[in-house]
Structures are given as C-alpha cells and as structure tokens.
C-alpha cells in the first residue's frame, strides 16, 4: 500500500501530465550479476542486436533475434516440430521532444524482444 | 544519427540531471498484437506474478517465475538434464520521490524476469 494513501497514482486521470524526473538512476548496479550465456545454451538460441537512438533515453537497447525456426534438440539438431519464438516485453523509454535540444522528454512504449523460448505448435498441419 | 548532432546525449555527464517528462505515452498500442500463450506452451513454462507498487510508474509490472527446474519434453514429462531459467531484463521505471505527494520522480532500474527458456547445463555431475 502507498505510504501516502491520499496521493493520486501516477496512472490516474487527474495526475499531472508533466512531471520532473531526476536522471540519477537508483539501483544502477542491478546488472552486476555476470552476463548470462543463456542466449547460446538455450534450445531456442538468439543473437543480441544493438538498437541505438540518440534521441531516446536509454540510447542503447539490446534486442534478441531467434537463430532458428525450430528448436535445438539434445543432439544439437534443429527440430522443426517445435518453434523458437521471441519473448517480447513492453518497456518505457524517454523520447526527446520536440526534437531539438530541450530538457523535455515524453514517455514512449517500446515492444522489445528479450530472448527466445521453445514452444509447441497448437495447430497440426501437413506441409 | 541524431537530428541535432550538437545536442548532448541524455547519458552524457554534462546533461542536466533533472528533466521534464510528459506522461502521455506515445506508441500506447504496441501491445495491440494478441496476448501470447507462450508461457503455457513453452518447454520451460512460467507463471506470471503481479508486482504492484503505487509509488512507482508503471505501478503494475508482471514478472515470470519458471514452473519447473527442468524442461518439459515432447511427452509432457520434466527432463532434469535440462534447466528452465528466467530471461531477465533491466527496465527503467519512475519512482516517486521524496516519497510524498509531489510531481517529482527519479529514474530507477529494475531487473525483471520476462519469461523462461530451456538451457543445457554446462557442468555435468553425478548426484
């Protein structure tokens, strides 16, 4: 529950549409855990691609592309009875507006692929 | 490349630490694609847990927890020679500060689990 139960939630309609944001990030070191190699060891491996946009904060976002159409089995062969699919997440970024050197930003939603997982098809069909 | 090459990048040291942010979200409908059922169909299925915090924007974030230690095989049995692991991503959220009804927020990093994938162990050992 909120520390101030009377405060409007930032998602409420009556909440101010423009707020002040401090860019000194808290929890800056959440990424201190070693970089995972799951992208290589997964049965649905992926490559990471750098998406860079200087008008955005953060300016660099890494996105996943599935390497295979099917999934890698225990023998290292691709099984096309299964599908490698991207796991997507909606994230919030700050977009500089109105596109000149101001300190004004707007929240923007981005749908990013974070990694891949192996799923069973639900439709059986003959190729 | 930036539309204004002379503009400081928001990650530069000389960029103002406090900026104005418009909360009217652009690209609000990136999630218009149908909700995916991969969490159930994956060989490393997961459950989604609601993480709610009214002092944060967005106040609701869904987090994945892998259902199994191993991965589900073609027969629906759990294979413990493989591991279900969470795919994690660092996201930015806005944290209300200094924790009373102000329009001031601070960027905060959160490490969230978005889904699970099935990986091969790198250490083989006998139990």
């Amino acid at each position: 529950s909120p520390q101030n139960p009377g405060c409007p939630n930032a998602e409420d309609k009556n909440f101010p549409r423009t707020v002040m944001v401090n860019l000194n990030i808290r929890n800056r070191n959440t990424n201190s855990k070693r970089a995972s190699d799951y992208y290589n060891r997964s049965s649905s491996p992926w490559n990471l691609h750098r998406n860079e946009d200087p008008e955005r904060y953060p300016s660099v976002i890494w996105e996943a592309k599935c390497r295979h159409l099917g999934c890698v089995d225990a023998d290292g062969n691709v099984d096309y009875h299964m599908n490698s699919v991207p796991i997507q997440q909606e994230i919030l970024v700050l977009r500089r507006e109105p596109r000149h050197c101001t300190n004004s930003f707007r929240l923007e939603k981005m749908l990013v692929s974070v990694g891949c997982t192996c799923v069973t098809p639900i439709v059986r069909h003959v190729a | 490349s930036p539309q204004n090459p002379g503009c400081p990048n928001a990650e530069d040291k000389n960029f103002p630490r406090t900026v104005m942010v418009n909360l009217n979200i652009r690209n609000r409908n990136t999630n218009s694609k149908r909700a995916s059922d991969y969490y159930n169909r994956s060989s490393s299925p997961w459950n989604l847990h609601r993480n709610e915090d009214p002092e944060r924007y967005p106040s609701v974030i869904w987090e994945a927890k892998c259902r199994h230690l191993g991965c589900v095989d073609a027969d629906g049995n759990v294979d413990y020679h493989m591991n279900s692991v969470p795919i994690q991503q660092e996201i930015l959220v806005l944290r209300r500060e200094p924790r009373h009804c102000t329009n001031s927020f601070r960027l905060e990093k959160m490490l969230v689990s978005v889904g699970c994938t099935c990986v091969t162990p790198i250490v083989r050992h006998v139990a």
Partner: nanobody, 125 residues
Framework: EVQLVESGGGVVQPGGSLRLSCADS????????MGWFRQAPGKEREFVAA????????YYADSVKGRFAISRDTARNTVYLQMNSLKPEDTAVYYC??????????????????WGQGTQVTVSS
C-alpha cells in the same frame, strides 16, 4: 498498413533460374522469421521456404529442396529466393510473408502476414 513488396518474377524456360526479392522498406520485420509461399491458379497458397530472423536457419518444402535457396540481407532489409532448375510445376504467383504467430510449425501459412501483391513466375518452353 505496412506491406512487403515482391519482385523478380518472369517467364523462364525449364531448367532456368530466377531470383525473387522481398523488400521490407519500413524495416518492420527485421526481427521476424520470413517465408516464401506460392499460389498456382485454382490452388491454395503453399509453403516454399522460410528463414529465421538472424538468417542462421532455413527450411524448405520437399518439392523445392536442393533447387531453391532462401537468404536475407539485413542491411538492405530484403529476403531473396534463388530458384534454380525450374520446372513447369513451379509456375505460380510467389508471395513473401512475415511470421507473426506460432500456432503451427514453420510451414503453416496462417502464421504469416503482411503479404505483398506477389510476383508471377512462369516456367514454360
């Protein structure tokens, strides 16, 4: 609505070659697997070949295996279908699609979308 644009079709003799292109001018599908399909008069659209988002993996219908090769150029946002040793039964309108769903296996036509107008391939002597 975003659409893919196919080109490169034409009339060719049996045993000849053609290279089809599928352009994604908006860069909308650089993270999607892509597929080529074909539709002959009076028949349903059928799967020909597919390629993964990274280009590392390809899959072919049995009828074209060893003769056709799918590839993608990420810099140009284009997917290609190199067709060799063409046969009269390859005559059809060829379409490319972006894989947007995963209800079926890789050759399931309904999992693909954003078709273009297609490009006609005619194999005839």
């Amino acid at each position: 609505e975003v659409q893919l644009v196919e080109s490169g079709g034409g009339v060719v003799q049996p045993g000849g070659s053609l290279r089809l292109s599928c352009a994604d001018s908006e860069r909308s599908f650089s993270f999607n697997a892509m597929g080529w399909f074909r539709q002959a008069p009076g028949k349903e659209r059928e799967f020909v070949a597919a390629i993964s988002a990274t280009g590392d993996d390809t899959y072919y219908a049995d009828s074209v295996k060893g003769r056709f090769a799918i590839s993608r150029d990420t810099a140009r946002n284009t997917v290609y279908l190199q067709m060799n040793s063409l046969k009269p039964e390859d005559t059809a309108v060829y379409y490319c699609g972006a894989r947007v769903n995963f209800d079926g296996t890789v050759s399931y036509t309904n999992d693909y979308a954003y078709w273009g107008q297609g490009t006609q391939v005619t194999v005839s002597s």
